[in-house]
């Protein structure tokens, strides 16, 4: 049961992060031209 809840929580967090990234309209990539 605990494992299931942990899995559910992890998936929820991943979905939330994905939604926020998608709605931000930004390329959340890091700089590749210099070592920022």
């Amino acid at each position: 049961m605990k494992r299931f809840l942990f899995l559910l929580l992890t998936i929820s967090l991943l979905v939330m992060v994905q939604i926020q990234t998608g709605l931000s309209g930004q390329n959340d990539t890091s700089q590749t031209s210099s070592p920022s």
């Epitope: 309209g25 930004q26 390329n27 959340d28 990539t29 890091s30 700089q31 590749t32 031209s33 210099s34 070592p35 920022s36």
Partner: antibody
Amino acid sequence: EVKLEESGGGLVQPGGSMKLSCVASGFTFNKYWMNWVRQSPDKGLECIAQIRLKSDNYATHYAESVKGRFTISRDDSKSSVYLQMNNLRAEDTGIYYCTPIDYWGQGTTLTVSS
Amino acid sequence: DIVLTQTPRTLSVTIGQPASISCKSSQSLLYSNGKTYLNWLLQRPGQSPKRLIYLVSKLDSGVPDRFAGSGSGTDFTLKISRVEAEDLGIYYCVQGTRFHTFGAGTKLELK
């Protein structure tokens, strides 16, 4: 879509001052070192000023040709970078790009002439 | 400062033929994190520069695979397998390992 919009260029007399501004969008601005790159027929493309991240205490670096005359700054809350230029010379004439090198805008033209 | 020397300064080509541009650095561009910050830009006539290649050989999004970057340390090359009309312009190498410096540019023009 990534956008970089430079503004503030124009005609200024030798010895005068000018401040360039740049607004960025479409990428995580506060993760990128930002630069002002000048393009002129004489010197081609040259990076004249660089500003790093908050985690680097906004460290700056300048080309010898502008050291002591130009100051770069940034405002991460506005995704903006600025270039304060004092004691301008004829050789400062050119197109000024605000760029992380990864992405480029259209630039703003500065002409220093009497 | 790191000096980048590009050759040739002008390259006259025929559409459909290959092209190659060299960029040599005065110092190694290998950074302490193991990455080499060597980029290639294209500036088409009347336009601002656009990056094509980063980290020596990685193509930016939307860049055709006829472009290829290679090299290490101080010697780098940009190759176009078959030149197309849209490839004409000035190519610049630019390093980001120690404060950005640019090559003088190579003008790719029609023969």
